[in-house]
């Protein structure tokens, strides 16, 4: 005879999934806006800073009362892997002036991967589908001047300050609804 | 200096609808959550929802889904709460307040707009 | 909902002294580090103020002899020497969840 069977798989709790990843997020997103403060200290920024390659905001006006688990984790997915990619090329490429940054924009780095296993995980957990493997992006062009790594700079942490709050939102918001 | 200014008190009839305004100035109005919150008298403060200014993305305490509405003018820094199908127990003061991204804590209030319901 | 219950509903005090203040949550608001509490003190005819953030944060402009503290379900906020201009109410109120709800509030009276 084979092996005897493994203890029953003990379906998760899903509010407690979703409870661990809101605390991370939670989390990333105090470390953001701590770090997008201390860029506006060093470098204020003159207005809104946009950078084409970021993805648009999830949250529109009706969407969050529409939200559905599955849909919130694959776009919160998506988009937190651009962002991702984007600290990355902002260490990279950002020029001398944002090496003020570090290590706070490496910390950040670590934890924005750490969130996107946490993701991951979730996902798996819960059994939802599993996105299909992200086609090669194409590689971001650098900044052209030192003063465009601080306006993408500007844009990067704002928008993953955004991005955060949705997901902390929308998480919380169908944590009620399991 | 931060401030939160709302529109004036408001006399309605039972079944009506209000609107309320809260203008922003002094900060960057996309860079925090605009809030709402009721305090009905003898009653303890109770959250109606907020909204991203940003994105003008509203989330509501399920008790006041379907009734109230909230919206923003990001170009006026003004933020709107409508509260429709008013009744008795919708008499109030209505504070709109500036919440911490992601952590609904209210660091700036508005000074409040009196709400009475009345036949 | 998270329930906040504090005590005392009224507490009556003269200046100088000190007032320690209680919030009990119906469960748990803190996680990994973070405490979800907020207190917010109300003078008559004014909107609320807050105090302090995260249970223990102190906002920017508040007096020193504020503090907050706690994590669980039990927390405190103390005045460490009342001055003439702390009687008021003081409610609680937590974000661990969605939605936020505050304390039925303290009461504090010059005694």
């Known amino acids: 005879p084979g092996p005897p069977p493994g203890p029953p798989r003990v379906s998760p709790d899903p509010r407690a999934e979703l409870d661990s990843t809101v605390l991370l997020t939670r989390s990333l997103l105090a470390d953001t806006r701590q770090l997008a403060a201390q860029l506006r200290d060093k470098f204020p920024a003159d207005g809104d800073h946009n950078l084409d390659s970021l993805p648009t905001l999830a949250m529109s006006a009706g969407a969050l009362g529409a939200l559905q688990l599955p849909g919130v984790l694959t776009r919160l997915r998506a988009d937190l892997l651009s962002y991702l990619r984007h600290v990355q090329w902002l260490r990279r490429a950002g020029g001398s002036s944002l090496k003020t940054l570090e290590p706070e924009l490496g910390t950040l780095q670590a934890r924005l991967d750490r969130l996107l296993r946490r993701l991951q995980l979730l996902m798996s957990r819960l059994a939802l589908p599993q996105p299909p493997p992200d086609p090669p992006a194409p590689p971001l062009a650098p900044p052209s001047s030192a003063w465009g790594g601080i306006r993408a700079a500007h844009a990067i942490l704002g928008g993953l300050h955004l991005t955060l709050d949705w997901a902390v939102r929308g998480l919380l918001l169908l944590k009620t609804r399991l | 200096e931060v401030q939160l200014v709302q529109s004036g008190a408001e006399v309605k009839k039972p079944g009506a609808s209000v609107k309320i305004s809260c203008k922003a100035s002094g900060y960057t109005f996309t860079d925090y959550n605009m809030d709402w919150v009721k305090q009905a008298p003898g009653q303890r403060l109770e959250w109606i929802g907020d909204i991203n200014p940003h994105s003008g993305g509203p989330i509501y305490n399920q008790k006041f889904t379907g009734r109230a509405t909230l919206t923003v003018d990001k170009s006026a820094s003004t933020a709107y709460m409508e509260l429709s199908s008013l009744r008795s127990e919708d008499t109030a003061v209505y504070y709109c307040?500036?919440?911490?991204?992601?952590?609904?804590?209210?660091?700036?209030w508005g000074q409040g707009t009196t709400v009475t319901v009345s036949s | 909902d998270i329930v906040l219950t504090q005590s005392p509903a009224s507490l009556a005090l003269s200046p100088g002294e000190r007032a320690t203040l209680s919030c009990r949550a119906s469960k748990s608001v803190s996680t990994s580090g973070y405490s979800y509490i907020h207190w917010y003190q109300q003078k008559p005819g004014q909107a609320p103020r807050l105090l302090i953030y995260?249970?223990?944060n102190l906002d920017s402009g508040v007096p020193a002899r504020f503090s907050g503290s706690g994590s669980g379900t039990d927390f405190t906020l103390t005045i460490s020497s009342l001055e003439e201009e702390d009687f008021a109410t003081y409610y609680c109120q937590h974000s661990r969840d969605l939605p936020p709800t505050f304390g039925q509030g303290t009461k504090l009276e010059i005694k």
């Open positions: 995260l249970a223990s």
């Open positions: 307040a500036r919440g911490e991204l992601g952590h609904w804590y209210f660091d700036v």
